[in-house]
């Protein structure tokens, strides 16, 4: 009997009520692997979620978030409100980044400006709530008579903020 069920392909289930015949998954359900005894109910993308891919008999629906929200987690398990650049999402909503921090995305947290002096460099362009500082040559490199053989270091590429 087990062998009969293992013959049932994805998109069907092994129907015990019908002598283990392979029956198609009912509407709004799916089975992504063969040999299933039941079909899973399709996920519905409603409210803040919108449908990216419709459910089929062999695969679950895939959701996205509506405009103004972004996906978090695997397969968009959650939607989180977007904020403006220069802000972060707190329990009380979107709040401006504190002085000395920035966020160049619509999501994630405000991060501290790069401390140029740690790399022996000087601040070339001041930071803002939306942008990190740009570090330039060290103060010694800018003094008269200093060698200019080495070009200034490029601005640091900010990493992605954590989800």
């Amino acid at each position: 009997l087990q062998d009969l069920c293992s013959n049932c392909p994805a998109g069907t289930f092994c129907d015990n009520n019908r002598s283990q015949i392979c029956s198609p998954c009912p509407p709004n359900s799916f089975s992504s692997a063969g040999g299933q005894r039941t079909c899973d109910i399709c996920r519905q993308c409603k409210g803040v979620f919108k449908t990216r891919k419709e459910c089929s008999s062999t695969s679950n629906a895939e959701c996205d978030c509506i405009s103004g929200y972004h996906c978090l987690g695997a397969e968009c398990s959650m939607c989180e409100q977007d904020c403006k650049q220069g802000q972060e999402l707190t329990k009380k909503g979107c709040k401006d980044c504190c002085f000395g921090t920035f966020n160049d995305q619509k999501r994630g947290i405000c991060r501290p400006w790069t401390n140029c002096s740690l790399d022996g460099k000087s601040v070339l362009v001041n930071g803002t709530k939306e942008r990190d500082v740009v570090c330039g040559p060290s103060p010694a490199d800018l003094s008269p008579g200093a060698s200019s053989a080495t070009p200034p270091a490029p601005a640091r590429e900010p990493g992605h903020s954590p989800q």
């Epitope: 978090l72 987690g73 398990s77 939607c79 989180e80 409100q81 909503g93």
Partner: antibody, heavy 120, light 107 residues
Framework: QVQLVQSGAEVKKPGSSVKVSCKAS????????ISWVRQAPGQGLEWMGG????????NYAQKFQGRVTITADKSTSTAYMELSSLRSEDTAVYYC?????????????WGQGTTVTVSS | DIQMTQSPSTLSASVGDRVTITCRAS??????LAWYQQKPGKAPKLLIY???SLESGVPSRFSGSGSGTEFTLTISSLQPDDFATYYC?????????FGQGTKVEIK
């Protein structure tokens, strides 16, 4: 301070429906998400579904699709959970809970719970 | 759905003990995990989110760690108020799911 206050205990017959309310105060009701989580006697917690009131349409765990309806009334800052075709296994404490960041997400504020007993 | 398995299911300890509870996910959930404390007849209370971030107002004796499939909640020095049931919750995959709970009781 955010508060979620739920309606009182209910005793229902198998096959009937129950509607539980959850009134929110102390926060911006429309933009936060309200979920419903149930806990059968001596059991763990189970997410049923939830709603962000400004969007008006709920999302449900697949297990409860077709049997649960979650709504929200922005004018009274109240969320509702209606469960139909009740059976004895639906005997549980039903909680409403708020998530403030991602939805459904983590729950930082909870109602006090509503006990629903399904018995013939 | 992702299964969350907590161990032990019951833990007997004394005030001042260091207590560790483990939560295992049936597949990787990155760091999308929370811990809740629940006392009899009360609603759960959020302690830890994102696996290791302490919720505002929660005592620093509570800490969380782990990522992927294995997570721990540690109470560095158990207090009388900490005797309760603790649940883990994953939000990485839809629908979110909870562990079955770990009851911390007085030895």
């Amino acid at each position: 301070q955010v508060q979620l206050v739920q309606s009182g205990a209910e005793v229902k017959k198998p096959g009937s429906s129950v509607k539980v309310s959850c009134k929110a105060s102390g926060g911006t009701f429309s933009s936060y998400a309200i979920s419903w989580v149930r806990q059968a006697p001596g059991q763990g917690l189970e997410w049923m579904g939830g709603i962000i009131p400004i969007f008006g349409t709920a999302n449900y765990a697949q297990k409860f699709q077709g049997r649960v309806t979650i709504t929200a009334d922005k004018s009274t800052s109240t969320a509702y959970m209606e469960l139909s075709s009740l059976r004895s296994e639906d005997t549980a404490v039903y909680y409403c809970a708020r998530s403030s960041g991602a939805y459904p997400g983590y729950f930082d504020y909870w109602g006090q719970g509503t006990t629903v007993t399904v018995s013939s | 759905d992702i299964q969350m398995t907590q161990s032990p299911s019951t833990l007997s300890a004394s005030v001042g003990d260091r207590v560790t509870i483990t939560c295992r996910a049936s597949q990787s959930i990155s760091s999308w995990l929370a811990w809740y404390q629940q006392k009899p007849g009360k609603a759960p209370k959020l302690l830890i989110y994102d696996a290791s971030s302490l919720e505002s107002g929660v005592p620093s004796r509570f800490s969380g760690s782990g990522s992927g499939t294995e997570f721990t909640l540690t109470i560095s020095s158990l207090q009388p108020d900490d005797f309760a049931t603790y649940y883990c919750q994953q939000v990485n995959s839809y629908p979110q799911t909870f562990g079955q709970g770990t009851k911390v009781e007085i030895k």
